[in-house]
């Protein structure tokens, strides 16, 4: 059985300020079991953008129904984009663990750039 891959098809995405940004992510397998999270940045200080398991993310919606059986699409949309949202976003798969989930594999990242709002 092939090991799960995390696919972020777009290397970069450009969005006008005020619009929504769709960041695409797909898994190639349902295994291992565990949540996905989206982060901005890749270092120790990376910012949590979305956690499938818990949390409040008012500007983030999922493109597909993540709880749907056999779902492999973990794309998200971030509303009302501002220049402060620019950065590289990573879709990360975690393996269910006890007491904590363990990071399993990360996508290659999608760089979001923000264009000035059209006048």
């Amino acid at each position: 059985e092939d090991e799960l891959q995390v696919i972020q098809p777009e290397k970069s995405v450009s969005v006008a300020a005020g619009e929504s940004a769709t960041l695409r992510c797909a898994m190639t397998s349902l295994i291992p079991v565990g949540p996905i999270m989206w982060f901005r940045g890749a270092g120790a200080g990376r910012e949590l953008i979305y956690n499938q398991k818990e949390g409040h993310f008012p500007r983030v919606t999922t493109v597909s129904e993540l709880t749907k059986r056999n779902n492999l699409d973990f794309s998200i949309s971030i509303s009302n984009i501002t220049p402060a949202d620019a950065g590289t976003y990573y879709c990360v798969k975690f393996r269910k663990g006890s007491p904590d989930d363990v990071e399993f594999k990360s996508g290659a990242g999608t760089e979001l750039s923000v264009r000035a709002k059209p006048s």
């Epitope: 999270m37 982060f39 901005r40 940045g41 890749a42 270092g43 120790a44 200080g45 990376r46 910012e47 949590l48 953008i49 949390g55 409040h56 950065g87 904590d100 989930d101 990071e103």
Partner: antibody, heavy 117, light 108 residues
Amino acid sequence: DVQLVESGGGLVRPGESLRLSCAASGFTFTNYAVTWVRQAPGEGLEWVSLISVTGTTYYADSVKGRFTISRDNSKSTLYLQMNGLRAEDTAVYYCAKVTWKNVFDYWGLGTLVTVSS
Amino acid sequence: EIVLTQSPGTLSVSPGERATFSCRASQTVGSKLAWYQQKPGQAPRLLIYDANTRATGIPARFSGSGSGTEFTLTISSLQSEDFAVYYCQQHTDWPPYTFGGGTKVEIK
């Protein structure tokens, strides 16, 4: 407005323990890494420890094995448990919010820890 | 561990003049270099990150430059509120995050 308020500092003897707290408000605490930085009297800044959003912890070599960083997301509070304190740990301890760029954009006012016999 | 060396240790400047000071890294940090300002009795304040990007609310008179191992912070026209200690910090992806020893900018 982002606010970070440290507490728990004080005067202790060498070998004793102290637990610092940092209460955060004005941002979604669960979404950010947070860190401790210290400053000995009249000296420069020294990074001490960081805890990521997923709970991974990092320490400076000078405190590894003696200090433990933790966070309680339900209380939006950061902690630093300091054991086996030494005179050289005497400093003002600041907590700070970490950006995704790994820089520290908001700081508390600090709490003074004095280790002396 | 990356060691950051700041120079000079103290800089005496008159208000309105230009102040330039440097930070040298013991190994390359790319553009991952930040600058902080600290006034007596206060917490540090982030000024610059990524070597040349001003943090939110920082006046345009503060500018950073450099890459690799050599970095510079310039204050184009010193205001009275700019007299303080300035620290550089490398902010590569993973700890330890090291600071330079600081440059004190004092009134001439």
